[in-house]
């Protein structure tokens, strides 16, 4: 139902990276506009994107005050310039979303290697532990400080003549890893929740290798 | 249910080559890790390689390296693992095995192993 | 390549005894050890996870212990089902290794 001029939205996906967290949808809309409702299953209902032209509307700010709760969307739609008109049944149209909960589902974000140190024969390679939209006190809490021991981080490591990628895993932000004297070797890190199923994995990393101006190097 | 089925083992001749497949079902292997062990008659456990079917990266022990090849089709879910040039010490039973991916659990499931004969 | 030296390669034992399996790794490697149990013909099954840590569905006869770079398995009662070969592997670098193995018999 609905009135002649309206369609429901369809193709309800969420988009979410480091729990900054959108809601996407089609059709892009001629002659109507949209508005997003979001709750928790045992909450209210909270407007949001109130009559927007937009296809996808920023859940952020809703999603962060509790990401391990489960949040269930709709998209409303409306005749454009009579906001006021319903469908048939004294209702506007609707659909829901999936349902999406941020701690289990928004996806992990490329990280970043903020540096490395080689002292002898051992690498200490840190890597950046990027914050998120989560706050805490006022205070944004960083990757590390929402997921704890659930984030754990792999690092793929290579001497430079080389392409077999060796590895190691650190539920820190920090690896030791032993490395052949006078050789040069190259890092790429992913971060990886291991108690998902899915999203388990983020991007790589980009490549960083000895010798450019990330590292240093101390002979000893 | 995860489950890991080997296939493509039989009997080759030295210097020969051989496709052996790995297929996966109850999870995605792009999400995990795959490795290859093998296991020679009455002998020990020998580990082979590894892919990340997510990047493609791969590493390979000394004994293998240059003659054998990871590689995974994630559309199929199925990791693979290339042999050539093959000598009779390659006489195994060949495992594959998913590696978990925490800081603490690796080969969590393995296959049930098929056996690569290499002999004239 | 960091080696895992594991002992006894074998022995004998009956229904109820305590059996202690060890293995040493080569140099340091934390707490990324694990333990498998193989019967004839099948393969390896997880124990033992991060040297200690006692496997979905394993049953708690079985235990890990660390001390340095010696590792410990512990089967406190043996029970018929026990009667296999069991391997250390560390996961600590690449590659993993795995130790010679322990087949545990019938006295």
């Known amino acids: 139902s609905g009135t002649t001029n309206t369609v429901a939205a369809y193709n309800l996906t969420w988009k979410s990276t480091n729990f900054k967290t959108i809601l996407e949808w089609e059709p892009k809309p001629v002659n109507q506009v949209y508005t997003v409702q979001i709750s928790t299953k045992s909450g209210d209902w909270k407007s949001k994107c109130f009559y927007t032209t937009d296809t996808e509307c920023d859940l952020t700010d809703e999603i962060v005050k509790d990401v391990k709760q489960t949040y269930l969307a709709r998209v409303f739609s409306y005749p454009a310039g009579n906001v006021e008109s319903t469908g048939s049944a004294g209702e506007p149209l609707y659909e829901n979303s999936p349902e999406f909960t941020p701690y289990l589902e928004t996806n992990l974000g490329q990280p970043t290697i903020q540096s490395f140190e080689q002292v002898g024969t051992k690498v200490n390679v840190t890597v950046e532990d990027e914050r998120t939209l989560v706050r805490r006190n006022n205070t944004f809490l960083s990757l590390r400080d929402v997921f704890g021991k659930d984030l754990i981080y792999t690092l793929y490591y290579w001497k430079s003549s080389s392409s077999g990628k060796k590895t190691a895993k650190t539920n820190t932000n920090e690896f030791l890893i032993d490395v052949d004297k006078g050789e040069n070797y190259c890092f790429s890190v992913q971060a990886v929740i291991p108690s998902r199923t899915v999203n388990r994995k983020s991007t790589d990393s980009p490549v960083e290798c000895m010798g450019q101006e990330k590292g240093e190097f101390r002979e000893i | 249910e995860v489950q890991l089925v080997e296939s493509g083992g039989g009997l080759v001749q030295p210097g020969g080559s051989l496709r052996l497949s790995c297929a996966a079902s109850g999870f995605t292997i792009s999400q995990y890790w795959i490795h290859w062990v093998r296991q020679a008659p009455g002998k020990g456990l020998e580990w082979v390689g590894y892919?990340?079917?997510?990047?493609?990266?791969?590493y390979y022990a000394d004994s293998v390296k240059g003659r054998f090849t990871i590689s995974a089709d994630t559309s199929k879910n199925t990791a693979h693992l290339q042999m050539n040039s093959l000598r009779a010490e390659d006489t195994a039973v060949y495992y594959c095995?998913?590696?978990?991916?925490?800081?603490?659990?690796?080969?969590?499931?393995w296959g049930q192993g098929t056996l690569v004969t290499v002999s004239s | 390549d960091i080696q895992m030296t594991q002992s006894p390669s074998s022995l004998s034992a009956s229904v109820g005894d305590r059996v202690t399996i060890t293995c040493r790794a080569s140099?340091?490697?934390?707490?990324?050890v694990a333990w498998y149990q193989q019967k004839p013909g099948k393969a390896p099954k997880l124990l033992i996870y991060?040297?200690?840590f006692l496997y979905s569905g394993v049953p708690s006869r079985f235990s890990g212990s660390r001390s340095g770079t010696d590792f410990t398995l512990t089967i406190s009662s043996l029970q018929p089902e026990d009667f296999a070969t069991y391997y250390c592997q560390q996961h600590y670098t690449t590659p993993p290794t795995f130790g010679q193995g322990t087949k545990v018999e019938i006295k």
């Open positions: 140099q340091d490697v934390n707490t990324a």
């Open positions: 095995a998913r590696d978990y991916g925490s800081f603490r659990v690796q080969l969590d499931y």
């Open positions: 892919i990340d079917p997510y990047n493609g990266y791969t």
């Open positions: 991060s040297a200690s």
